[in-house]
C-alpha cells in the first residue's frame, strides 16, 4: 500500500471511531435493564455516563440528569474522565492529521515535518483509542460486578404481609453504548497505527538510497527514493524540477511515468 | 379529544366467538398501546392483555391466553379483541382503554356488554 | 401475579369529612431508575368506566377535583379524599402498573354515611 493511502486510510478510519468515540460518550445506553429471567415489568431503565432514563410501556420517556459530581461512583468519574480525554486527544489528532496529510498542501512544510506530524497524529489516535477502550471496559466490570451482586441478592424479604413482600432488584447488562465504544476505540487505534506506519514511509533513511539505480543524465533531474515516493528533503530547490521517465527509480517501483504522489 | 367508541352489546351461545371493537379517535393511533380490561357483573377489573398498534405486538395475561386474541387494524384506527370457545364465566363488560402516564389507563371506551346463554 | 389487597371493603364517611382507602401491593411498585411508584387510583360510578385520578401513586390527573390525593410508597400506599361530597360515591380500584399483568385491587364501595 502507497504511504498517501495508507496515511489517508488510517485518518479516515480514525476520524470514523472518533465519531463512534463521542456518539458512545453521548449515548444513555452504557447500562440496560436485564429482562432476562426477570420478572416482566411495564418499565424500562437504561443509564448512560451523564444521566438516567425511563422508558414506560406507555411510551413515555423521562430521563434525568446526574446533578451532582461528589454523590457519583468514583469509577463512573474515572470513565468519564476517560472518554473525555479520549474525544479531546482525538480532536488534537485530527487537526495534526489534517497538516500532516500528504495530498494536502500547505505552505513549504517539508515531508520531514509531515512525517512529524503524521507519527505525532497516530500517537494520539492510539493513546485515544486505548483511553474509550479502557472506559468502556472498566464500565463493562462495574456492570458485571453489580450484575453478580444483584444476582446474589435478586430478592430481599421485606417485613410487611408477614414477610411475603419481595422487593425486586433491577438488574443491568451492557447497553449498545459499549459496543460502540469498544468498536471506535478500536477502530480509532488501528486508523493510529495506520499513521504511524505511513509514517515510516514519509521518512528518509540512509538505506533508502542503496536500492537507487541511477541513470546518468547531465541535465538536472531530481533523483527520489520511489519506493517511499516523496522528496528527500535535502533541498528545496528540487520541488518544481522536471521528473524525467528515465530518472530515479527503485527496485520496487512499478511507474515509470510520474505519479500524483510525485508533486506535494 | 381523544375517543374510544366500541361496538355494541353481544348475545352468544356457548362454545361461540365473539369479536369486540374499539374505534380510536382523536390522537396518533400508532403511537399509543390499547389495553383490553374485563367487568364480570358486580366484581372488579381484570387485566387482559394490551397491543402496541404500530408493531402489531402483543402482551397477554396468561389466564386470557388461548382465549382472547388482540389485533389492530391501522388503516381504520380499530383495535379488536375476539374471544373464543365462549363459556357462562365469560359474561363481562369489556373495556379498552388507551395508555398514559404511568403506564395508566386515561381514556377508556364505553364498555361492550358480551353475554354468553344457552 | 402481584397481588393488589385494598381495605377496607367498603366504607360510609360523612360529607365533608375524611375518606381514607388503603392499597398494599405483594411487591414493591417503586422504580429505582426513576424513584416512582407505578400504582393507579381509579374511581367507578355505576355504569360507567373507570376514571383516572391518580398515576404514580401521587399525581393528580388534570381535572381531577384536589380533595383527592395519593399516598405511599413501595408496597404500601393510601387514597385520601380530604372533604367527602356527594358525587364521591363510588368504587375505588388501586391498580399495579409495574408488573405484567397488570392487576387490580378487589375496590373500596364509598357510601355516604
Known amino acids: 500500500m502507497s504511504v498517501t493511502a495508507c496515511q489517508g486510510l488510517g485518518f479516515v478510519v480514525s476520524l470514523i471511531g472518533f465519531a463512534g468515540i463521542i456518539a458512545a460518550t453521548c449515548m444513555d445506553q452504557w447500562s440496560t435493564q436485564d429482562l432476562y429471567n426477570n420478572p416482566v415489568t411495564a418499565v424500562f431503565n437504561y443509564q448512560g455516563l451523564w444521566r438516567s432514563c425511563v422508558r414506560e410501556s406507555s411510551g413515555f420517556t423521562e430521563c434525568r440528569g446526574y446533578f451532582t459530581l461528589l454523590g457519583l461512583p468514583a469509577m463512573l468519574q474515572a470513565v468519564r474522565a476517560l472518554m473525555i480525554v479520549g474525544i479531546v486527544l482525538g480532536v488534537i489528532g485530527i487537526l495534526v492529521s489534517i497538516f500532516a496529510l500528504k495530498c494536502i498542501r500547505i505552505g513549504s512544510m517539508d515531508d520531514s515535518a509531515k512525517a512529524k506530524m503524521t507519527l505525532t497524529s497516530g500517537i494520539l489516535f492510539i493513546i485515544s483509542g486505548i483511553c474509550a477502550i479502557i472506559g468502556v471496559s472498566v464500565f463493562a466490570n462495574m456492570l458485571v460486578t453489580n450484575f453478580w451482586m444483584s444476582t446474589a441478592n435478586m430478592y430481599s424479604g421485606m417485613g410487611g404481609m408477614g414477610g411475603m413482600v419481595q422487593t425486586v432488584q433491577t438488574r443491568y447488562t451492557f447497553g449498545a453504548a459499549l459496543f460502540v465504544g469498544w468498536v471506535a476505540g478500536g477502530l480509532t487505534l488501528i486508523g493510529g497505527v495506520m499513521m504511524c506506519i505511513a509514517c515510516r514511509g514519509l521518512t528518509p533513511d540512509d538505506s533508502n538510497f542503496k536500492a537507487v539505480s541511477y541513470h546518468a543524465s547531465g541535465q538536472n533531474v531530481a533523483y527520489r527514493p520511489g519506493g517511499f515516493k516523496a522528496s528527500t528533503g535535502f533541498g528545496s530547490n528540487t520541488r518544481n524540477k522536471k521528473i524525467y521517465d528515465g530518472g530515479a527509480r527503485t527496485e520496487d517501483d512499478e511507474q515509470s511515468h510520474p505519479t500524483k504522489y510525485d508533486y506535494v | 379529544q381523544v375517543q374510544l367508541v366500541q361496538s355494541g352489546a353481544e348475545v352468544k351461545k356457548p362454545g361461540s366467538s365473539v369479536k369486540v371493537s374499539c374505534k380510536a379517535s382523536?390522537?396518533?393511533?400508532?403511537?399509543?398501546?390499547i389495553e383490553w380490561v374485563k367487568q364480570a357483573p358486580g366484581q372488579g377489573l381484570e387485566w387482559i392483555g394490551l397491543?402496541?398498534?404500530?408493531?402489531?405486538?402483543?402482551n397477554y395475561n396468561e389466564k386470557f391466553k388461548g382465549k382472547a386474541t388482540i389485533t389492530a387494524d391501522k388503516s381504520t384506527s380499530t383495535a379488536y379483541m375476539e374471544l373464543s370457545s365462549l363459556r357462562s364465566e365469560d359474561t363481562a363488560v369489556y373495556y379498552c382503554a388507551r395508555v398514559y402516564y404511568g403506564n395508566s389507563f386515561a381514556y377508556w371506551g364505553q364498555g361492550t356488554l358480551v353475554t354468553v346463554s344457552s | 401475579d402481584i397481588v393488589m389487597t385494598q381495605s377496607p371493603d367498603s366504607l360510609a364517611v360523612s360529607l365533608g369529612e375524611r375518606a381514607t382507602i388503603s392499597c398494599k401491593s405483594s411487591?414493591?411498585?417503586?422504580?429505582?431508575?426513576?424513584?416512582?411508584?407505578?400504582l393507579t387510583w381509579y374511581q367507578q360510578k355505576p355504569g360507567q368506566p373507570p376514571k383516572l385520578l391518580i398515576y404514580?401513586?401521587?399525581t393528580r390527573e388534570s381535572g381531577v377535583p384536589d380533595r383527592f390525593s395519593g399516598s405511599g410508597s413501595g408496597t404500601d400506599f393510601t387514597l385520601t379524599i380530604s372533604s367527602l361530597q356527594a358525587e364521591d360515591v363510588a368504587v375505588y380500584y388501586c391498580?399495579?402498573?409495574?408488573?405484567?399483568?397488570?392487576?387490580f385491587g378487589q375496590g373500596t364501595k364509598l357510601e355516604i354515611k
Open positions: 404514580w401513586a401521587s
Open positions: 382523536g390522537y396518533a393511533f400508532s403511537n399509543y398501546l
Open positions: 397491543i402496541n398498534p404500530g408493531s402489531g405486538g402483543t
Open positions: 411487591q414493591s411498585l417503586l422504580n429505582s431508575g426513576n424513584q416512582k411508584n407505578y
Open positions: 391498580q399495579n402498573d409495574y408488573f405484567y399483568p397488570f392487576t
